[in-house]
């Protein structure tokens, strides 16, 4: 039976086996098409999620759908139930925490009192002044905290204590891509990781170790990508993997935070990359040990120059590396996080693509996660 399961798939009506390699190949090999059912699925970008969190102390903002304007949430009469509703609107199922933070001098949005209507936050109609003088600072999930802070050096071996959200995404027990834990059910990675193998069955996630192959594998229930854009085929390089069973968090298994919607990182901002990928462009071999490196944001204009990517880097991507080259992600690092540390660690980018590895004019190109927050929230909500 083990051999049969490994190499064959059972079609129903009539019962017969087909080679497993015909699963999710885009061709209907079973009479009822069930060989194309448990495959990578695409999910549209969907409607705007009407709540968001700002980098200004994780303050809650609410959309007035009638006008398209955003408002900051006043702390007056804000309750745990409203906090849960806000987080549910973003697809979180965990218990949130919230607190009052003073309205700052740079507050540029109108501040309104919040209420709830059919499981969505709304602005209170007769909203007077914000008497508390405070905004709502909301955290939907405890995230982005590690046991150990990395040292700022070029490239060195990494410890899972520093990066407890890093996972290895494997097909048939072979490491293919990196990924990041976002919550107990969800792992963030790159869509292109699943281009060659689109059957969900053979994909596994390994979490909790910095060594390849030394930790138990977790079954995957779903792999979700965004609809492919024919004009910009390198855009939308983002995927969410739903685990069959929720993770139990520990010192070595923890989630990283999503970025804030307004997380604009200026050129030269320090960032971190990690992965088990090739250590040389033509090295032809994955690293057995997790490696980490410090890099920095590279200006998109520079990245799109004639001697670099010639306009191929879109607004939904970002470049990172070091100006002189030599420190970069490479084959096998795809899907892993590009990370920024403020109070917590945030996954601001996903290792996506590049020409070669480590070239001075062609740094790594990363999916800009803040451009896809709406999509992530919509996927999570649909799967709640």
């Amino acid at each position: 039976k083990v051999i049969l399961d490994k190499y064959y798939f059972l079609c129903g009506q009539p019962l017969h086996f087909i080679p497993r390699k015909q699963l999710c190949d885009g061709e209907l090999d079973c009479p009822l098409g069930e060989d194309e059912e448990h495959c990578v699925k695409s999910f549209p970008e969907g409607p705007a999620v009407a709540v968001r969190l700002s980098k200004d102390r994780s303050t809650l903002q609410v959309l007035d759908s009638a006008t398209g304007n955003w408002f900051s949430a006043c702390f007056d009469n804000f309750t745990e139930a409203l906090a849960e509703t806000a987080c549910r609107q973003m697809g979180y199922s965990s218990k949130p925490t919230f607190r009052a933070v003073e309205i700052g001098p740079d507050q540029d949005l109108d501040v309104v009192e919040i209420t709830e209507n059919s499981q969505e936050l709304r602005m209170r109609n007769s909203s007077g002044p914000c008497l508390s003088g405070s905004l709502v600072s909301l955290h939907c999930l405890a995230c982005g905290k590690s046991l150990k802070t990395p040292r700022v050096v070029g490239v060195e071996e990494a410890s899972v204590d520093s990066w407890p959200w890093q996972v290895s995404i494997q097909y048939d027990k072979q490491h293919v891509c990196g990924g990041s834990i976002l919550d107990p059910h969800w792992v963030l990675t790159a869509a292109h990781c699943f281009r060659k193998h689109t059957d969900v069955f053979n994909w596994k996630v390994r979490a909790g170790s910095d060594k390849l192959g030394s930790f138990p594998s977790l079954a995957v229930a779903k792999i979700i990508i965004i609809e492919f854009n024919p004009m910009y085929p390198k855009d939308n390089d983002i995927a969410l993997m739903k685990l069959q069973f929720p993770l139990t968090f520990s010192g070595t298994v923890r989630p990283i935070c999503l970025p804030f919607f307004d997380e604009e990182l200026t050129p030269a901002t320090p960032l971190w990359i990690i992965g088990w990928g090739f250590t040389k462009q033509n090295g032809g071999k994955m690293s057995d040990i997790l490696l980490q490196a410090s890099v920095q944001v590279i200006d998109s204009t520079r990245c799109n120059a004639d001697d670099a990517y010639q306009g191929e880097v879109t607004e939904k991507m970002m470049c990172a590396g070091i100006p002189e080259g030599g420190v970069d992600t490479c084959q096998g690092d795809s899907g892993g996080p590009l990370m920024y540390q403020s109070d917590q660690w945030h996954v601001v980018g996903i290792v996506s693509w590049g020409y070669g590895c480590g070239g001075p004019s062609t740094p790594g190109v990363y999916t800009k996660v803040s451009a896809y927050l709406n999509w992530i929230y919509n996927v999570w909500k649909a799967e709640l």
Partner: antibody, heavy 126, light 107 residues
Framework: EVQLLESGGGLVQPGGSLRLSCAAS????????MSWVRQAPGKGLEWVSS????????YYADSVKGRFTISRDNSKNTLYLQMNSLRAEDTAVYYC???????????????????WGQGTTVTVSS | DIQMTQSPSSLSASVGDRVTITCRAS??????LNWYQQKPGKAPKLLIY???RLQSGVPSRFSGSGSGTDFTLTISSLQPEDFATYYC?????????FGQGTRLEIK
């Protein structure tokens, strides 16, 4: 067997309309972006329009923009091209094609049209 | 938009010959180039993608080379079924434009 079958071509007067259909079979139609390509008599190939798998993205050649509309019905495994305000220069064989994007080194994509229909002829003449 | 220019526009050769068709892009397209074969009254068929990669089911006598702006399709030993028109297509940026074609005839 993977197949695309176009229909709907014919003779139409300048300024008239036609709707081309392309029926897909043997593959998961809803997973693929699709395109229309045309070939005028004795001429080369010209890309006309493309549509993404769930219709979120639609693109057109400048020569047909505003006159042609691409659409698809994934429940019927069918691609369409609605052609309005037809001109003599739209006379061609129209092919539908399946778009593939295969993964290269380090996340780079390579594009091609790997499955084509047999074509349907559109003649615009008075 | 990127323009693609093929040469020659037609050529005559015999069975067993080695044949080379070239394609030039108006700007650099890295290796984002496809080659198609089309026989009279038939739909085009994808032969080579990414400049050098053979599409599955295509005989190994077909090969592609080049990068940047200059590309070549080579047929190492012509077979009777290879007489057709060949098109290059850039797949670097929309719209994905085709060359004007090269007609390969029996000498």
């Amino acid at each position: 067997e993977v197949q695309l079958l176009e229909s709907g071509g014919g003779l139409v007067q300048p300024g008239g309309s036609l709707r081309l259909s392309c029926a897909a079979s043997g593959f998961t139609f809803s997973s693929y972006a699709m395109s229309w390509v045309r070939q005028a008599p004795g001429k080369g190939l010209e890309w006309v329009s493309s549509i993404s798998s769930a219709s979120s993205y639609k693109y057109y050649a400048d020569s047909v923009k505003g006159r042609f509309t691409i659409s698809r019905d994934n429940s019927k495994n069918t691609l369409y091209l609605q052609m309005n305000s037809l001109r003599a220069e739209d006379t061609a064989v129209y092919y539908c094609a399946r778009d593939i994007y295969s993964s290269g080194w380090r996340g780079y994509y390579y594009y091609g049209m790997d499955v084509w229909g047999q074509g349907t002829t559109v003649t615009v003449s008075s | 938009d990127i323009q693609m220019t093929q040469s020659p526009s037609s050529l005559s050769a015999s069975v067993g010959d080695r044949v080379t068709i070239t394609c030039r892009a108006s700007q650099g397209i890295r290796n984002d180039l496809n080659w198609y074969q089309q026989k009279p009254g038939k739909a085009p068929k994808l032969l080579i993608y990414a400049a050098t990669r053979l599409q599955s089911g295509v005989p190994s006598r077909f090969s592609g080379s080049g990068s940047g702006t200059d590309f070549t399709l080579t047929i190492s030993s012509l077979q009777p079924e290879d007489f057709a028109t060949y098109y290059c297509q850039q797949a670097h940026s929309f719209p994905y434009s085709f060359g004007q074609g090269t007609r390969l005839e029996i000498k």
